[in-house]
Interface confidence: low
């Protein structure tokens, strides 16, 4: 539909500041929360997010569609994404929220349908985790921890 | 099917694996490099990226346009981004590469022109840094370091 896309709601040239609606869990990893947080706080935040994910319908969401009713960038994107839980028992935190692109293509801004001539790709970032390094069996020494950076998808973008 | 934009180069239904061309600095923070890296390696990688940024034309790039010649996702995106250097002398690393959206709107996939009825927004992630915490003047005690998580833009996505 050759027409300026669907962000222009009546009397509104472009979306205003996105603010959470009622009953909406702030799962949006895109929003800039605080400029920085302590490590302990960061790990606590991750645990909270994982808990929120488990309690929300977010994990079940597999639909390639844009939702203009929601304030979160991840659901308003042309390359929308949801979150899955990246689980690894040999890591602290064991569970990490990871972005998962909901479309192979991108949402065509005119038809609001998936368009496979573009491609949704993850935007990766490196996050700090602690790896449990245990000696191979039969275990003789204790497990050690090493701080490492793990690559994780934090969002999706639409490319040609 | 809403088929669209200009990704369909001759004989190519969708972009293949993106691989760097000659003389191209792999500045793409979107690509998944290694699953994980040690902290020291991570800090070294950041220093290398900052050095590459300083030596490339990347910092001067301010144009809202898609470049299909380049392999990097950040230049092929409907919400293209470049990198700036986030400089903070009270932090280690002092310099962090930060994504900067090149468009206020997004690139319209039909016209390849900027379309202000959509909006480019940063995708944020939290990265580990060490903060130098020094007592206020007159300084009596030594400066300490605290590991904190700093929020930084790692890419951009296009929203309605």
């Amino acid at each position: 539909q050759p027409r300026s896309p669907k962000s222009k709601r009546k009397g509104q040239g472009r979306p205003g500041p996105l603010a959470p609606g009622p009953h909406q869990v702030p799962l949006d990893l895109v929003s800039r929360m605080k400029p920085y947080a302590r490590m302990e706080e960061y790990e606590r935040n991750i645990e909270e997010m994982v808990a929120q994910l488990r309690n929300s319908s977010e994990l079940a969401q597999r639909k390639c569609e844009v939702n203009l009713q929601l304030w979160m960038s991840n659901k308003r994107s042309l390359s929308p994404w949801g979150y899955s839980i990246n689980h690894d028992p040999s890591r602290i935190p064991v569970d990490l929220p990871e972005a998962r692109c909901l479309c192979l293509g991108c949402v065509n801004p005119f038809t609001m349908q998936e368009d496979r001539s573009m491609v949704s790709v993850p935007v990766f970032s490196q996050v700090p985790v602690r790896r449990r390094l245990c000696p191979p069996p039969p275990r003789t020494g204790p497990c050690r921890q090493r701080a490492v950076m793990e690559t994780i998808a934090v969002g999706c973008t639409c490319i040609f | 099917q809403p088929r669209s934009p200009k990704s369909k180069r001759k004989g190519q239904g969708r972009p293949g694996p993106l691989a760097p061309g000659p003389h191209q600095v792999p500045l793409d923070l979107v690509s998944r490099m290694k699953p994980y890296a040690r902290m020291e390696e991570y800090e070294r990688n950041i220093e290398e990226m900052v050095a590459q940024l300083r030596n490339s034309s990347e910092l001067a790039q301010r144009k809202c346009e898609v470049n299909l010649q380049l392999w990097m996702s950040n230049k092929r995106s409907l919400s293209p981004w470049g990198y700036s250097i986030n400089h903070d002398p009270s932090r280690i690393p002092v310099d962090l590469p930060e994504a900067r959206c090149l468009c206020l709107g997004c690139v319209n996939p039909f016209t390849m022109q900027e379309d202000r009825s959509m909006v480019s927004v940063p995708v944020f992630s939290q990265v580990p840094v060490r903060r130098r915490l020094c007592p206020p003047p007159p300084r009596t005690g030594p400066c300490r370091q605290r590991a904190v998580m700093e929020t930084i833009a790692v890419g951009c996505t296009c929203i309605f």
């Epitope: 539909q1 050759p2 027409r3 300026s4 896309p5 669907k6 962000s7 222009k8 709601r9 009546k10 009397g11 509104q12 203009l68 038809t111 349908q113 001539s117 | 099917q1 809403p2 088929r3 669209s4 934009p5 200009k6 369909k8 319209n108 996939p109 039909f110 016209t111 390849m112 009825s117 309605f160």
Partner: antibody, heavy 119, light 112 residues
């Protein structure tokens, strides 16, 4: 002046295919969408789909998927519609019409091509 | 699909009379961007359709000012203040707000 010149009438057998053309002149072909519209004898107008010549991108009305295939030849500023597996139901006048991105209206229409499906 | 229903099917008028054609959509055709892509076209016998009105009430260039469009949401009207002989033909409304785009069934304006 701006014109969309369509190919002449076609008489085709059931089950066959036909490719009709729409040649644009007087404007930059790659800047406008080309739409196709069907009009059965004594009936109203039905939108089939569009193609954007700048990129070759297409969008079809669900009803016409598999029936119509839209293509363009930028070098000759010509849009084509291939109609396949024809039946008597496909007998109609087919129009092309252009629209500019950001507007929607069909400001220029083609002359129309009559397709008759008969054995 | 959005169903566009035009009334009347046939409209007999005398030259110089006012004519009014109604078009009703099965759902709101206000696009999410705030625009309403409702057009009116006139098709004379043996000819291609011609654009008269776009976005509900905007007259296309060269269209006489006796033609006017109005309405909102789901109800739209085309008015011809003083019908002339050259106005005779079939009038179609069209919505371009939701895919698939759809035309009304047409209203035939004829001489009484």
């Amino acid at each position: 002046q701006v014109q969309l010149q369509q190919s002449g009438p076609e008489l085709v057998k059931p089950g066959a295919s036909v490719k009709i053309s729409c040649k644009a002149s007087g404007y930059t072909f790659t800047d406008y969408f080309i739409n196709w519209v069907r009009q059965r004898p004594g009936q109203g107008l039905e939108w089939i789909g569009w193609i954007f010549p700048g990129s070759g991108s297409t969008y079809y009305h669900e009803k016409f998927k598999g029936k119509a295939t839209l293509t363009v030849d930028k070098s000759s500023s010509t849009a084509y519609m291939l109609l396949s597996s024809l039946t008597s139901e496909d007998s109609a006048v087919y129009f092309c019409a252009r629209t500019l991105y950001g507007n929607w209206y069909f400001d220029v229409w083609g002359t129309g091509t009559t397709v008759t499906v008969s054995s | 699909d959005v169903l566009m229903t035009q009334t009347p099917l046939s409209l007999p008028v005398s030259l110089g009379d006012q004519a009014s054609i109604s078009c009703r959509s099965s759902q709101s055709i206000v696009h999410s961007n705030g625009n309403t892509y409702l057009e009116w076209y006139l098709q004379k016998p043996g000819q291609s359709p011609k654009l008269l009105i776009y976005k509900v009430s905007n007259r296309f260039s060269g269209v006489p000012d006796r033609f006017s469009g109005s309405g909102s949401g789901t109800d739209f009207t085309l008015k011809i203040s003083r019908v002339e002989a050259e106005d005779l033909g079939v009038y179609y409304c069209f919505q371009g707000s939701h895919v698939p785009y759809t035309f009304g069934g047409g209203t035939k304006l004829e001489i009484k």
